[in-house]
Amino acid sequence: QSFQVNPPESEVAVAMGTSLQITCSMSCDEGVARVHWRGLDTSLGSVQTLPGSSILSVRGMLSDTGTPVCVGSCGSRSFQHSVKILVYAFPDQLVVSPEFLVPGQDQVVSCTAHNIWPADPNSLSFALLLGEQRLEGAQALEPEQEEEIQEAEGTPLFRMTQRWRLPSLGTPAPPALHCQVTMQLPKLVLTHRKEIPVLQSQTSPKPPNTTSAEPYILTSSSTAEAVSTGLNITTLPSAPPYPKLSPRTLSSEGPCRPKIHQDLEAGWELLCEASCGPGVTVRWTLAPGDLATYHKREAGAQAWLSVLPPGPMVEGWFQCRQDPGGEVTNLYVPGQVTPNSSS
């Protein structure tokens, strides 16, 4: 006689919401074997018993977690096989904060995995990556675990958050870090990853009167996704003494995008220029506060933007759009940046 369980593992991980069948069968030389599942919770799956076999159907609910035992007997001989069933939830729902990292600032980055089960620090681990390696020098703060607010009762899913204090990101700063969350289950390792773009600062010297960091530029072909998706990051080359600075994209491919220049000597006037062939127009589409309160001059492939009355540029995101195509370039200007006083 032979006693078989399929799948044969003694531990089985089942994704929440998915079903699994465990078939236990036994052949018997002296007639029909008796096969049944025991140690079942009333809620643990459903059992279909046939001559010489028994099928346990697990529905992928958290209540299905348990250790049923299949018992098979043939005459005076009996066999048994236990299966530890672990139902897990690990959707690709990572949220990182902040949305962008600013080099040169002592900052905390957090990564939250939502709707997790089991909420066990031994099975869930977080890592902050630079490329494929753990970021050296990051300091892990205490992890947090909170129960998610659920619409349905009896589904205690959790969100787990890990925070890190970042080391200096170096010069030049890397284009991005990644939060990686790994769930380690019996014979199963699952990983999700979320990018945290690093804003690249201009590399020219600071003007004498700046009291905070320089502006940062990033480009994206989609306005709506600029905050949540991977971005082509641009940097500003150095060319003292503070002339108009033109962004240069780090990626060699992709659509042709507008360029934003800053004229530090003209009271922080911004110029957006189309960088492609003829027939392209540009316009300012976003500025902190109300765009209507700014002074705008638009002339085909060039568009100027300045503050009224003349003064320091307001803190926040500025965006210029190029048509046709809809490509945009975003510029972030930190607060308290004062124009260069030319001597």
Partner: antibody, heavy 119, light 107 residues
């Protein structure tokens, strides 16, 4: 010169409260995460609590969670530790300390203030 | 929590001796380790940070090495003012933890 000067220690009965202060000078206080570290008589160093530069992040050792509260007043360059429900095992020298951005080692320590919990 | 184990807990040495103190972490802490010196009645003083970097103003006879879980503090030639208690500390993750200390006494 960078300096940290603790005050507020003393003798208190079990169950009592005490508030420690730490006056900082010689550096931009609001840019630094600050810590309290304690040392029981004849024992080693034990980290107690931290607070971030803006005060937005705090954390505590399990042994003091729910009883101690760390806070700071950046306008006064002062760090505080409010200690409630004190126990005999809280008896120690309490040091105020600063850690360095990007490195996170504790590079500056105060001279310490002694807290004695006894009836 | 990450446990830090120092050895020896105490040692006797003479002026001019080479002294080595070891510190072991219960899990990898990369290079997030500092060494402190403390004299009786005084606050600790930072000697080494990032496992092997000498803090400004600290004599070059002090050196640190190691990465991952095993670390060493070496005093190349012990001076009279070096008799003190030395602590290692990991700051890779919270709660930050200290070794139990190594007391260096005069032989």
């Amino acid at each position: 010169e960078v300096q940290l000067l603790e005050s507020g220690g003393g003798l208190v009965q079990p169950g009592g409260s005490l508030r420690l202060s730490c006056a900082a000078s010689g550096f931009t206080f609001s840019s630094y995460w600050m810590h309290w570290v304690r040392q029981a008589p004849g024992k080693g160093l034990e980290w107690v609590s931290y607070i971030s530069g803006s005060g937005g992040y705090t954390n505590y050792a399990d042994s003091v969670k729910g009883r101690f509260t760390i806070s700071r007043d950046n306008s006064k360059n002062t760090l505080y530790l409010q200690m409630n429900s004190l126990r005999a095992e809280d008896t120690a020298v309490y040091y105020c300390a600063r850690d360095r951005p990007y490195y996170y080692d504790i590079d500056v320590w105060g001279k310490g203030t002694t807290v004695t919990v006894s009836s | 929590d990450i446990q830090m184990t120092q050895s020896p807990s105490s040692l006797s040495a003479s002026v001019g001796d080479r002294v080595t103190i070891t510190c072991r972490a219960s899990q990898s802490i990369s290079s997030s380790l500092a060494w402190y010196q403390q004299k009786p009645g005084k606050a600790p003083k930072l000697l080494i940070y990032a496992a092997s970097s000498l803090q400004s103003g600290v004599p070059s006879r002090f050196s640190g090495s190691g990465s991952g879980t095993d670390f060493t503090l070496t005093i190349s030639s012990l001076q009279p003012e070096d008799f003190a208690t030395y602590y290692c500390q990991q700051y890779k993750s919270y709660p930050v933890t200290f070794g139990q200390g190594t007391k260096v006494e005069i032989k």
